[in-house]
């Protein structure tokens, strides 16, 4: 067994069940007109 | 069948620690996605607080990071909530549902939690 | 952070009728690298959690009847139902599942004329 409190990731999603939305670094930040 | 509950207790007193547990049947926390903590205050929006995934890592809205930990217990296919600080503008419906990478496609009944002295 | 902006916030209509609702985000929820908008929608009723209805702006959820549609790109969405059910009658909200922290609209309240 295991209790944790984990640790801050920043990875994008890299499987199909991974629950990571994409997070691009690159994302735009213009808003919208 | 995939479920999720959350528990926990229904009136906090302000500056006080919330502590909430979802429960999770259905599939092991170790298989995968992540599950995230969301919360909605009466009659408004939702709100995502932050999730853990199903690797231990975990990721925190910066509007509340200062007060939070998202933690598992595996051998319970339990996470737990901490929220420190606890303040009347807290006060809110706090559901956990399971995030695939498109959406939340499970999510618990909440819990509602009133912070008041 | 990605705003969403629901319009409007509420709607009457009576069953039978041909519903729309609109989100827009602050900021493209395009992602290059699979040409999907990560926008999804969900319902809510009076005391019960949200309900996945669509993810990836137009596909589907299991089990949602083919009445609800989503459609957009970018950052202008739509959700329509095509012929308002009874049980259609809840709140609506739009969710951008692109960037974290992840960001819920404001909702639309759809009630019976």
């Known amino acids: 067994s295991e209790t944790t409190t984990g640790t801050s990731s920043n990875s994008s999603q890299s499987t199909s069940n991974s629950g990571l939305a994409p997070n691009p670094t690159n994302a735009t930040t213009k808003a919208a007109g | 069948q995939v479920t999720l509950k959350e528990s926990g207790p229904a009136l906090v007193k302000p500056t006080q620690t919330l502590t909430l547990t979802c429960t999770v049947t259905g599939y092991s926390i170790t298989s995968g996605y992540t599950v995230s903590w969301i919360r909605q205050p009466p009659g408004k929006a939702l709100e995502w607080i932050g999730y853990?995934?199903?690797?231990?890592?975990?990721r925190y809205n910066p509007s509340l990071k200062t007060r939070l930990t998202i933690s598992r217990d595996t051998s319970k296919n339990q996470f737990v909530l901490t929220m420190t600080n606890m303040d009347p503008v807290d006060t809110a419906t706090y559901y956990c549902?399971?995030?695939?990478?498109?959406?939340?496609?499970?999510w618990g009944q909440g819990t509602t939690v009133t912070v008041s002295s | 952070d990605i705003q969403m902006t629901q319009s409007p916030s509420s709607l009457s209509a009576s069953v039978g009728d041909r519903v729309t609702i609109t989100c827009r985000s602050s900021?493209?929820?395009?992602?290059?690298?699979?040409?999907?908008?990560?926008l999804t929608w969900y319902q809510q009723k009076p005391g019960k959690a949200p309900k996945l209805l669509i993810s990836w702006a137009s596909t589907l959820a299991s089990g949602v009847p083919s009445r609800f549609s989503g459609s957009g790109s970018g950052t202008d969405f739509t959700l329509t139902i095509s012929s308002l059910q009874p049980e259609d009658f809840a709140t609506y909200y739009c969710q951008q599942y692109f960037i974290y922290p992840l960001t819920f609209g404001g909702g639309t309240k759809l009630e019976i004329k």
């Open positions: 900021q493209s929820l395009l992602y290059s690298s699979d040409q999907k908008n990560y």
């Open positions: 853990i995934q199903y690797t231990g890592s975990t």
């Open positions: 549902a399971r995030g695939t990478t498109a959406s939340f496609d499970y």
